[in-house]
Each structure stands twice: as C-alpha cells, then as structure tokens.
Amino acid sequence: HTAAQDNCTCPTNKMTVCSPDGPGGRCQCRALGSGMAVDCSTLTSKCLLLKARMSAPKNARTLVRPSEHALVDNDGLYDPDCDPEGRFKARQCNQTSVCWCVNSVGVRRTDKGDLSLRCDELVRTHHILIDLRHRPTAGAFNHSDLDAELRRLFRERYRLHPKFVAAVHYEQPTIQIELRQNTSQKAAGDVDIGDAAYYFERDIKGESLFQGRGGLDLRVRGEPLQVERTLIYYLDEIPPKFSMKRLTA
C-alpha cells in the first residue's frame, strides 16, 4: 500500500499544491509559480523549483581543479522561463529586457544583452563538480566509506543512476563529488545531474525540497557529516561565451 495518495502530497517536492482531481480521483500535484503538473515519483526540474521559489514568500536565506571553462552560479536567484517539459529556456530575460543565455542547469553562460540576443540551443551541462568542506571531526573519514555513502545517497535519495557519479575525492576537510552525464548517456526517465545536484545543494544548506519533516541526516559509519561550505562548478558540452572584459575583471 502507498500512503502518498491518502495524504495527497508530493514526497519529492514540498513547493507544490496537490488535490485529488487527477484521473479516477488520483492525487495530482502542480508546482507553485508555474502551475505545471509534476511527477512526484521523481525529482522536479530545477527550472520549476526556481520558479516556485521565486513565487513563494521570501525568507531570510585527490582533488580536482575546475577547468578554465567551469561556471559558478554567481548571479543567484532569478525567475526563470521554463519550457513545457520544465527545462530552462535557452534565453532568459528579466523585467527590464536584459537577456542572457543559460545552460541546462540555468546558469548564465554569456554576457548580458538586450532582446536581440540569440541563444540558438540549450547547451547541456555534462559535468558538475560539487566541492564541499566538512566541519572538523575527531579524525578523517575513511575514504572508501565516504565514497560508498555519498554514492548511496545520490542513488537512494536523489534517484540518480550510479553510473552518473563519476568520482568522489577526499582530502580532509575537502570532499569533491563529480557528476557526469552526456546527452547520449541520459535515457528517458533518468534523473538529470543538474536536478540531483540542486536537491543535494539545498539539502546540505538545510533547505530540503522534499516533503519530509527533518531534512538530510548524512552519516558515515554513524559519524555525522556536516558541511560548512559548498561550491558547485558547472562544465558545459560547449564552452561558455564571455567577453574578455569579464574574464579579466
């Protein structure tokens, strides 16, 4: 028996409105902000989550060297345009007609322009590097235990296929998780690495997107893994196009 229908809530997305008005009185949930129907058996797309977040009342809120083309989300929150599948539209514009191109995780990958700016395609982010620093512990975590637990976390909590967790690196106190997913590798029904990374980021910050009451409790052999700093780098299948002015700023 499954309880989700009884409660008519969305286990994977708390930023929804649910009611038993689906076919046969089934529970149907719609994302706040966009009103789009969401599949509560899997993660909601980052675009719909950002849109919901912007519509909600505002609350107070062996290590890898990232490539020269790696993007960091410095622009912060914005109210995105999502396509009918819930993906980011390649071109995003604000209320003052300033436009820019984004990648599949919604991070700006060009200089800002005006309404004449063209973004021919949504460029896929195929490599995500999650860089964490954990709080001091009595000793270092065992690398293989940490690796196994983080892989398990992404598989079980975020439903990300294990093949997309490319590596887990550890040099106390820095942990790096590499997610890789090319367009050709992603099958129908596969969770997108961008969505998994976003859910993980929000979990780590104590802002869980899941319906659960408590938030993430991550432990390695019973020892709590508490993160004090998170940095996420995004690498696209096509390098970003920024002017030299920005690169030297």
Epitope: T2, A3, A4, P11, L153, R157, G214, G215, D217, R219
Partner: nanobody, 126 residues
C-alpha cells in the same frame, strides 16, 4: 518498493509480553526511517513507535511510553517492537511501515510513511 512482512503477533494475557518482528526486502532498509502502526477495530490507524534510519532518534505514543521499545538491526534488515505490560486496549492489528524518503533526520510521523505490510494481530485478553 520495499516489501515488509510482520510476525510475532498472537494471543497474550494482560501484563504479558510479545516481540514483533518485521523483515524488509526489495529496497535498502538501512537508510529509511521505520515505524510500527496499529489499528484497533473501528478506530483510526495510529503511530505507536518510530525510529530514524540511523537509530539516533525514536518516538513513542504517550499510551505506550515506558512499555514498548522499538529497535532495528540494519545488518538483518529487521525492525522490532518489544511490547511489555500489555493491556486490553493494545489489542489491534500491528503494521510495520517504511518511510518514503531515505536519509531523513528525526523520527518519522504517520504521514511520512509510504508503505506498510499486511499486519499481525495482537490480542490481549484473559
């Protein structure tokens, strides 16, 4: 989806003890919060006791505090409920339940459970 199979129910006299067991299969048991629910005839299903995935957090309904103990053995994929000082009002079908979301902190609430077993009947009578 997780499969849950309860055992250990039966007829017991008031003041007696029983130990319920729940064997889990089909999904990784060890990272999910678990609980025992019960339903007496003509009454709503209620949460008796729950335990977080790590075992660091437990909850007991006021009516069973000090008498019932929930525990889990992740190496055996098994959940237990030790019931002591049983009373007639403990008579019910007892269900083992698994939380919908892994790696959650705190003990699960009734609404957090996504699946449960077929139940085992506990009858307390002289």
């Amino acid at each position: 989806q997780v499969q849950l199979l309860e055992s250990g129910g039966g007829l017991v006299q008031p003041g007696g003890s029983l130990r319920l067991s729940c064997a889990a299969s089909g999904r990784s048991f060890s990272r999910y919060g678990m609980g025992w629910l019960r339903q007496a005839p003509g009454k709503e299903r209620e949460l008796v006791a729950s335990i977080s995935w790590s075992g660091h957090s437990t909850y007991y309904a006021d009516s069973v505090k000090g008498r019932f103990t929930i525990s889990r053995d992740n190496s055996k994929n098994t959940l237990y409920l030790q019931m002591n000082s049983l009373r007639a009002e403990d008579t019910a079908v007892y269900y083992c339940a698994a939380e919908s979301l892994p790696y959650e902190s705190g003990s699960p609430r009734l609404t957090d459970f996504a699946s449960w077993g077929q139940g085992t009947l506990v009858t307390v009578s002289s």
